[in-house]
């Protein structure tokens, strides 16, 4: 499956749009800062079957809607941005859908290795367990936003990495 | 391979302006903000003020505000420290640094070779 | 602002030596603090970050630790190239402050 070049488009305009939700100077949450021990080794992306390192950029980018459709979130940031954002993620999951139902099954067998799905789920889960112990506060939201950021670059490469070995 | 390059060193007189650069590559340089650092002969670091290259958001060191104006140009991945009217007392060695924003990585972690100032009549 | 303070400001010791540094914040930083290493001539160089966090390249003799206001930077065993001035330096909160330096030289 070829990832069609509307989905690179789509995901630097995600990256946009999450830059510009923006909403207060960032140098006052320094003492926000958190690790969220992001799963880099799941992006490497060198020992994977192409199967899976779809799934991983799928779930990165359900878990990020899931994420941005909260109460909470509608809340914290920007609606207009917010339905921008909702709008490119969810045409990049229907493309990587597509490559999912290809790649993942092989003669009626599934290719997956669950760990690196359960990986990125379990990254996410430290990220909505912060938001919930810092009670959702703008800085805290900022800090996830910067770290929604930072995956999504990590997803970006592990695309062209994706792309070079086609 | 990260870099940091600085102008080259600036001999001045009082009174006269002055702009430095420091330019990013081997990374995104927006992902990443850009710190000013003074040392002065002899003695220890100052921190000055921190740019956010994606929006150019600034935060000075209220010991330098005022003192020093901090921009920068994302098309060219370059931080500037500038001077409007220099005193003697800005002669001082000038380093610019990578700081990872709000993400979760190391401070400061790549640094510019310095731009030496010296002012004087 | 915060201030540091380190102490000593300057120390002499022998090749092999343990040496420990340490620094203070008025407030507490949580660990938000790196140590910086910063030879003659030669822009500083991150050692230690998040207090404890050792900055890859950076040989394994460099530790650190302490969180709040109390931190400590130890070489544990001193090689030639080690002689050199350490500061810490809060990333707490903006204006983000460095300590006053602390010179290690040979005894």
């Known amino acids: 499956c070829d990832l069609p070049q509307t989905h690179s488009l789509g995901h630097r305009r995600t990256m946009m749009l999450l830059a510009q939700m923006r909403r207060i100077s960032l140098f006052s949450c320094l003492k926000d800062r958190h690790d969220f021990r992001f799963p880099q080794e799941e992006f490497d992306g060198n020992q994977f079957q192409k199967a899976e390192a779809i799934s991983v950029l799928h779930e990165v980018i359900q878990q990020t809607f899931n994420l941005f459709s909260t109460k909470d979130s509608s809340v914290a940031w920007d609606e207009r941005l917010l339905d921008k954002l909702y709008t490119e993620l969810y045409q990049q999951l229907n493309d990587l859908e597509a490559c999912v139902m290809q790649e993942v099954w092989v003669g009626g067998t599934p290719l997956m290795n669950e760990d690196s799905i359960l990986a990125v789920r379990k990254y996410f889960q430290r990220i909505t367990l912060y938001l919930t112990e810092k009670k959702y506060s703008p800085c805290a939201w900022e800090v996830v936003r910067a770290e929604i950021m930072r995956s999504f670059s990590s997803s970006r490469n592990l695309q062209e990495r994706l792309r070079r070995k086609e | 391979e990260v870099q940091l390059v600085q102008s080259g060193a600036e001999v001045k007189k009082p009174g006269e302006s002055l702009k430095i650069s420091c330019k990013g590559s081997?990374?995104?340089?927006?992902?990443?903000?850009i710190g000013w650092v003074r040392q002065m002969p002899g003695k220890g670091l100052e921190w000055m003020g921190i740019i956010d290259p994606s929006d150019s958001d600034t935060r000075y060191s209220p010991s330098f505000q005022g003192q020093v104006t901090i921009s920068a140009d994302k098309s060219i991945s370059t931080a500037y420290l500038q001077w409007s009217s220099l005193k003697a007392s800005d002669t001082a060695m000038y380093y610019c640094?990578?700081?990872?924003?709000?993400?979760?990585?190391?401070?400061?972690?790549?640094w510019g070779q310095g731009t030496l100032v010296t002012v004087s009549s | 602002d915060i201030q540091m303070t380190q102490s000593p400001s300057s120390l002499s010791a022998s090749v092999g030596d343990r040496v420990t540094i340490t620094c203070r914040a008025s407030?507490?930083?949580?660990?938000?603090l790196n140590w910086y290493q910063q030879k003659p001539g030669k822009a500083p160089k991150l050692l230690i970050y998040?207090?404890?966090s050792l900055q890859s390249g950076v040989p394994s003799r460099f530790s650190g630790s302490g969180s709040g206001t109390d931190f400590t930077l130890t070489i544990s065993s001193l090689q030639p190239e080690d002689f050199a001035t350490y500061y810490c330096?809060?990333?707490?909160?903006?204006?983000?402050?460095f300590g006053q330096g602390t010179k290690v030289e040979i005894k």
């Open positions: 998040a207090a404890s």
């Open positions: 081997g990374y995104s340089f927006t992902s990443y903000w």
């Open positions: 640094a990578r700081h990872p924003g709000l993400n979760w990585a190391p401070d400061f972690d790549y």
């Open positions: 330096q809060q990333s707490y909160s903006t204006p983000l402050t």
């Open positions: 407030q507490s930083i949580s660990s938000y």
